[in-house]
């Protein structure tokens, strides 16, 4: 192990230098380990499982946004192995608080039961 090598680097025995770990393609995540000077002989990249995605590199697969369950929004674009889901307008019975600052997830829809009078998404 070479402690001078970075998080995503291994010690190349041939050159004696730190070398970048091979990055994974979008839709894949690293399997086994590479970094801080060492690389498993069988290090590789495996596909993201269902409901997860990765932009590649050294990123692990992350779960798609749950538009309906968490955001109470419609699904504009379902996620795949390479892309997160994109959420659309609120589900029926929910409305968007436009003046709220976005949280780390983006906009969240709130129940019309909590809506101020005459909220357009909740009228009718």
């Amino acid at each position: 192990e070479d402690s001078n090598c970075g998080e995503n680097e291994y010690h190349n025995q041939t050159t004696g230098l730190c070398q970048q770990c091979p990055p994974c393609r979008p839709g894949e995540e690293p399997y086994m380990s590479c970094g801080y000077g060492t690389k498993d002989d069988d290090y590789g990249c495996v596909p993201c499982p269902a409901e997860k995605f990765s932009k590649g590199g050294y990123q692990i697969c992350r779960r798609h946004k749950d538009c309906e369950g968490f955001f109470r929004a419609t699904v504009l674009t379902p996620g795949d192995m390479e892309n997160d889901a994109e959420c659309g307008p609120c589900l029926p019975g929910y409305y968007m608080l436009e003046n709220r600052p976005r949280n780390i997830y983006g906009m969240v829809c709130y129940s019309c039961l909590l809506a101020p009078p005459n909220t357009k998404e909740c009228v009718g």
């Epitope: 091979p22 894949e28 399997y31 192995m81």
Partner: antibody
């Protein structure tokens, strides 16, 4: 040019031994993990053994463990399968196959060599 | 070990047909599913890797899909040269295992 070429097959008596070879060309052999896969007559494919690029990781199917030995000579770009205590059920076409770099599948296959175990 | 099952051992279709070959794993293999074509002369070739990705040089009429335990290979416009046996393979866990194969013939 054929990237993988197996040799060493033939007729062997039960209990006998045989060494198969797989000559690689047209790519940097030492960069790739390699597998042996076999196919009994009129049957499906069966994974037999794997050796990583630097020989630090070696795995066998339970059906051949203790009887078969996979090895490689990176300087000669050659993969080997030493088979001992052969049984009739080892009769098959034996393929060597390359593991794609960073991936867990076989991206290039040889044409195969036939081993027949019979008295 | 993970068992791979190809429920159809042989099928016959006409030129130009759309053909789907299915494969089921005994447990979730997280899209680590590959498809191989074995021609009548014994030649084996990788078609699709990691469920849906085409190996370079493979005609676009071959496509793959699925997730979890259920996967399929589709040939959208059957040609004479597609006469072969098709095998699925899981690369998730050693020992690697294959389906029993589906032999495709032309009517």
């Amino acid at each position: 040019e054929v990237p993988l070429e197996e040799s060493g097959g033939g007729l062997v008596k039960p209990g006998g031994s045989r060494k198969l070879s797989c000559a690689a060309s047209g790519f940097t052999f030492s960069d790739y993990g390699m597998h042996w896969v076999r196919q009994a007559p009129e049957k499906g494919l069966e994974w037999v053994a794997y050796i990583s690029s630097g020989s630090s990781a070696i795995y066998y199917a339970d059906t051949v463990k203790g009887r078969f030995t996979i090895s490689r000579d990176n300087a000669k770009s050659t993969l080997f399968l030493q088979m001992t205590s052969l049984r009739s059920e080892d009769t098959a076409m034996y393929y060597c196959a390359r593991r794609e770099i960073l991936r867990y599948y076989f991206d290039v296959w040889g044409a195969g060599t036939t081993v027949t175990v019979s008295s | 070990d993970i068992q791979m099952t190809q429920s159809t051992s042989s099928l016959s279709a006409s030129l130009g047909d759309r053909v789907t070959i299915s494969c089921r794993a005994s447990q979730d293999i997280s899209n680590n599913l590959n498809w191989y074509q074995q021609r009548p002369d014994g030649t084996v070739k990788l078609l699709i890797y990691y469920t849906s990705r085409s190996q370079s040089g493979v005609p676009s009429r071959f496509s793959g899909s699925g997730s979890g335990t259920d996967y399929s290979l589709t040939i959208s416009n059957l040609e004479q040269e597609d006469v072969a046996t098709y095998f699925c393979h899981q690369g998730k866990t050693l020992p690697y295992t294959f389906g029993g194969g589906t032999k495709l013939e032309i009517k």
